[in-house]
């Protein structure tokens, strides 16, 4: 009765971002069913002929899987029974970006939800004092970013100050010819101050802080994905 389509079930996805070359997760949950054998999960991608992944009768069914996803996908099989249809995606590629559909069939009915998946590269910056420089200088480095981000320096003491005139940022293409290493140097640094190096593109925003005093140096970094509720 449910499978005939007279009932719809709630399926929920979360927009997310994948880091190129790393493993990612496309999140999807649904109203659980009591019998695993009654649950069918299909992941589809807009513009792709074959399936991204299919799970039915308690196991993967990859006969219709598109070649671009071969050997790269898995659901959390032990969590399907509790309503987790999230997809693990190995070795995220730039071309994995797009609109995905999480389609669920259970004995209660059918349901689906779309998910926007962005791909790029993002990494934590590290800020250090550059002792090789002639004046007090800070060096902010982050190994992998794509698309090319913006880099902005800020200071706790000089809030609102524009450091673009006293900083220099360079982008160096990494060996795989997609992602880039970000290096930004800030000159004329004063002691007893906290400086922040903020790197941002349309996927992520990362900040590296450094507090420089006469007696110690303290560092802190954090990274936040944008347009994602995760």
């Amino acid at each position: 009765f449910g499978i005939s389509g007279r009932h719809s079930i709630t399926v929920t996805t979360v927009a997310s971002a994948g880091n190129i070359g790393e493993d990612g997760i496309l999140s999807c949950t649904f109203e659980p069913d009591i019998k695993l054998s009654d649950i069918v999960i299909q992941w589809l991608k807009e513009g792709v002929l074959g399936l991204v992944h299919e799970f039915k009768e308690g196991k993967d069914e990859l006969s219709e899987q598109d070649e671009m996803f071969r050997g790269r996908t898995a659901v959390f099989a032990d969590q399907v029974i509790v309503g987790n249809a999230s997809l693990r995606l190995k070795n995220v590629q730039l071309t994995d970006a797009g609109t995905y559909k999480c389609y669920i069939i259970t004995s209660k009915g059918k349901g689906n939800a779309n998910l926007e998946y962005k791909t790029g590269a993002f990494s934590m910056p590290e800020v250090n004092v550059d002792y090789n420089a002639s004046s007090e200088t800070l060096r902010c480095e982050a190994p992998r970013w794509f698309p090319q981000p913006t880099v902005v320096w800020a200071s706790q003491v000089d809030q609102g100050a524009n450091f673009s005139e006293v900083s220099n940022t360079s982008f160096e293409l990494n060996s795989e010819n997609v992602t880039m290493k970000v290096v930004s140097v800030l000159y004329n640094v004063t002691i007893n101050n906290t400086y922040s190096c903020m790197i941002e593109n349309d996927i992520a925003k990362a900040t590296g802080d450094i507090k420089v005093t006469e007696s110690e140096i303290k560092r802190r970094s954090h990274l936040q994905l944008l347009n994602s509720k995760a």
Partner: antibody, heavy 120, light 107 residues
């Protein structure tokens, strides 16, 4: 438990085609969460992944061997096979078949292996 | 293709001692790495997958660690049956590739 067994000629002449079959017992080759792979090991050397097949017949081959390799499956016999054409002495190796996870893609279990010597 | 490099080529260890084997990937493979044990005349046996998850039936003395490009297999206290050749394998991208192996021999 699941077992794999390789079979085929132990001696192949240069320029001919090497043919091996892997018979799966203790489980179905149609188990959806797995691929079925071939790996080889020249005497005293390391391991080289040859390629894999899904029960539906879709294959993926190592680019270094792609022009010479064919992997096929016979679900009715619970078997999959390897053909390697235009062999040379460099293809002399122990050939293993193995079950390969769809992801993670580890090999487990393996067949015991069969030595194929290429010589005239 | 991703090149896997294992070191050392040979490791001489006394029974009961700890053995640490290294595997390095030419580019990041995330945690998509497996370790195998091979004894003479036998097929390889899966020990670890996902860089750190022990396969079914593998004793707790075997542990794997690392991610990205640097990985380690540790055997906490070598038993006589552990003397063998150990291979790492990346399954991050096709073609899947193996390291050249580390032979663990009795000192």
């Amino acid at each position: 438990q699941l077992q794999l067994q390789e079979s085929g000629p132990g001696l192949v002449k240069p320029s001919e085609t090497l043919s091996l079959t892997c018979t799966v017992s203790g489980g179905s080759i149609k188990s959806g969460s797995y691929y079925w792979g071939w790996i080889r090991q020249p005497p005293g050397k390391g391991l080289e992944w040859i390629g894999n097949i899904y029960y539906s017949g879709s294959t993926y081959y190592n680019p270094s061997l792609r022009s010479r390799v064919t992997i096929s499956v016979d679900t009715s016999k619970n078997q999959f096979s390897l053909k390697l054409s235009s062999v040379t002495a460099a293809d002399t190796a122990v050939y293993y078949c193995a079950r390969e996870g769809s992801y993670p893609n580890q090999f487990d279990p393996w067949g015991q292996g069969t030595l194929v010597t290429v010589s005239s | 293709e991703i090149v896997m490099t294992q070191s050392p080529a040979t490791l001489s260890v006394s029974p009961g001692e700890r053995a640490t084997l290294s595997c390095r990937a030419s580019q990041s493979v995330s945690s998509n790495l497996a370790w195998y044990q091979q004894k003479p005349g036998q097929a390889p046996r899966l020990l670890i997958y996902g860089a750190s998850t022990r396969a079914t039936g593998i004793p707790a003395r075997f542990s794997g660690s690392g991610s990205g490009t640097e990985f380690t297999l540790t055997i906490s206290s070598l038993q006589s049956e552990d003397f063998a050749v150990y291979y790492c394998q990346q399954y991050h991208s096709f073609p899947f590739t193996f390291g050249g192996g580390t032979k663990v021999e009795i000192k």
